[in-house]
């Protein structure tokens, strides 16, 4: 996977009039290392890593920068024509990627009330716009006021682009020290569910880095995909991924099942406890809808932040 | 049937390394992981280790890193353990052994270890 | 890491009777516990797996039993081939430690 910085930025709107600063946060290398503190209009650290690894002036530089985006933003956002009354909000999504190849790639991507209308190439300047009218519709009223404002001329997306890959390359640079291995913690839950059938969950935490392997195996060997259930590998928000893998079992055969772990060149085997208190039924948790840091905040105002 | 074949007794000096075979047939290699067992002479049996042939994925037992490193070779259906800075504490009989889930169902005939000078 | 103390260390024992091996575990091990004998010169056979499950092949005359820290492994009416050593295993967590054995002997 290539080495990314994303920066995800927000404005809302209520009944026409654009309200006050914006919400953001940072990731690197899919792992979330900054957030913006609304209150204190101030770029911080997320993630203990982060906070150990980066220093005060990454966090002024940071501030610096995303209070310009978020400027940019709700300017951007006082010229969409077609705010009815209610709700509305503005999102954009920066990423740029360093590959293995050394090779560079720069994007940026707007939503309007969650819904993608126009992506840009940083480093071709091409636009992209979705086929439906309403996405049209927004493209132009943006692209149009961006065409008035001096700032937004190619040497300013280079700039952007320059900028973006600079600050991952110090970020990866001085995140050397992140960069280590650690091993999930590996627990194993079961739940009842009807006809003598019980679900086995098997959970991987804190682990780094992001790949691992997580199956269930029955007499050593591993179960056909089509009989369990994964979820995402998701950032726990400390610098390191969870995820789970599920699978149905006939109740009784417990023993025959064990969750097989495979991470950094390291395997361990992980059997299923025995006893009627670790059926577990409150384990069973919606593993779908999954958010992190400030989506909460979007959440109670009902508004689609895009990861 | 399933069978796990090893290499023959090896008698070797202080200080020197020995890797030792386990050739696995009678079933998909790639399958099953193979776990390795060291018994000192007239004692018990210990656990060193295991592997899963079809990445090469490893899994030690603390007391033993440093010493073994396991590997496989999927070509051939075998599994390898070298055993380095060898002492007379190393002299034991060496096993391969299938784990069938949460239990060894296999096991190969043993190699015997001497280490002397 | 899970100890197993397996008792007695060893045993004295003529064709006909019954004896039975005890295996008691420093922390639950949950059931997952293997029985294995050997004979002198050989590899270790399974015997029993998952506590009371006989393996292939196994005579009915052994049988194991046990939960938590507490497990068993008992033969009935020995036979002339039952002699030899007998080692519990754990496969609870790593590392998979194995009993200190049990010498069964002819009297």
């Known amino acids: 996977e290539p080495h990314s910085l994303r920066y995800n930025l927000m404005v809302l709107s209520q009944d026409g009039s654009v309200q006050s600063g914006f919400l953001a946060e940072g990731h690197l290398d899919g792992q979330p290392f900054l957030r913006y503190d609304r209150q204190k209009r101030r770029a911080k650290p997320q993630g203990q890593w982060a906070e150990d690894v980066l220093g005060a002036k990454t966090w002024d530089t940071e501030t610096e920068d995303l209070t310009e985006n978020g400027q940019d933003l709700r300017r951007t956002l006082t010229h969409i024509k077609d705010q009815k009354g209610g709700l509305h909000s503005l999102q954009e999504i920066r990423v740029c990627e360093i590959h293995e190849d050394s090779s560079t790639r720069g994007s940026r991507h707007f939503y309007y009330d969650g819904e993608l209308f126009l992506s840009q190439n940083l480093e071709t300047q091409e636009s992209t716009v979705p086929q439906s009218s309403r996405a049209q519709t927004l493209a132009m009223n943006v692209t149009n006021f961006w065409k008035e404002d001096a700032m937004k001329t190619k040497t300013h997306y280079r700039a952007m682009q320059a900028d973006c890959l600079q600050k991952l390359q110090r970020y990866l640079k001085s995140g050397v020290a992140i960069r280590r291995t650690v091993p999930p913690m590996v627990n194993v839950t079961c739940s009842e569910v009807s006809e003598g059938n019980i679900t086995v969950t098997c959970r991987a935490s804190s682990f780094y880095p992001r790949n691992i392997t997580l199956t269930w195996r029955q007499d050593g060997v591993s179960l056909s995909h089509n009989t369990q259930q994964w979820g995402d590998v998701l950032p726990d928000g400390n610098g390191t991924y969870q995820t789970w893998v599920a699978t149905r079992i006939r109740q009784g055969e417990e023993q025959r099942f064990t969750c097989y772990m495979e991470h950094s060149g390291n395997h361990g085997t992980h059997p299923v406890p025995s006893g009627k208190a670790l059926v577990l039924q409150s384990q069973r948790t919606d593993h779908h809808h999954h958010h992190h840091g400030l989506n909460d905040i979007f959440e109670a105002q009902k508004i689609e932040w895009h990861e | 049937q399933v069978q796990l074949q090893q290499s023959g007794a090896e008698l070797v000096r202080p200080g020197t390394s020995v890797k030792v075979s386990c050739k696995a047939s009678?079933?998909?290699?790639?399958?099953?992981?193979i776990e390795w067992v060291k018994q000192r002479p007239g004692q018990g049996l210990e656990w060193i280790g295991g592997?899963?042939?079809?990445?090469?994925?490893?899994n030690y037992n603390e007391k033993f890193k440093g010493k073994a490193i396991l590997t496989a070779d999927k070509s051939s259906s075998t599994a390898y353990m070298q055993l380095s800075s060898l002492t007379s504490d190393d002299s034991a009989v060496y096993f391969c052994?299938?784990?069938?889930?949460?239990?060894?169902?296999?096991w190969g005939q043993g190699t015997t270890l001497t280490v002397s000078s | 890491d899970i100890l197993l103390t397996q008792s007695p260390a060893s045993l004295s024992a003529s064709v006909g009777e019954t004896v039975t091996i005890t295996c008691r575990a420093s922390?639950?091990?949950?059931?997952?516990l293997a029985w294995y004998q050997q004979k002198q010169g050989k590899s270790p056979q399974l015997l029993v797996y998952?506590?009371?499950t006989l393996a292939d092949g196994v005579p009915s005359r052994f049988s194991g039993s046990g939960s938590g820290t507490q497990y068993s492994l008992k033969i009935n009416s020995l036979q002339p081939e039952d002699f030899g050593s007998y080692y519990c295993?754990?496969?609870?967590?790593?590392?998979?430690?194995f009993g200190g054995g049990t010498k069964l002997e002819i009297k």
């Open positions: 052994a299938r784990l069938d889930g949460n239990y060894v169902g296999y």
């Open positions: 009678g079933y998909a290699f790639t399958d099953y992981l």
């Open positions: 592997i899963n042939p079809g990445s090469g994925s490893t």
């Open positions: 922390g639950n091990i949950h059931n997952y």
């Open positions: 998952h506590a009371k």
């Open positions: 295993q754990h496969f609870w967590s790593t590392p998979w430690t």
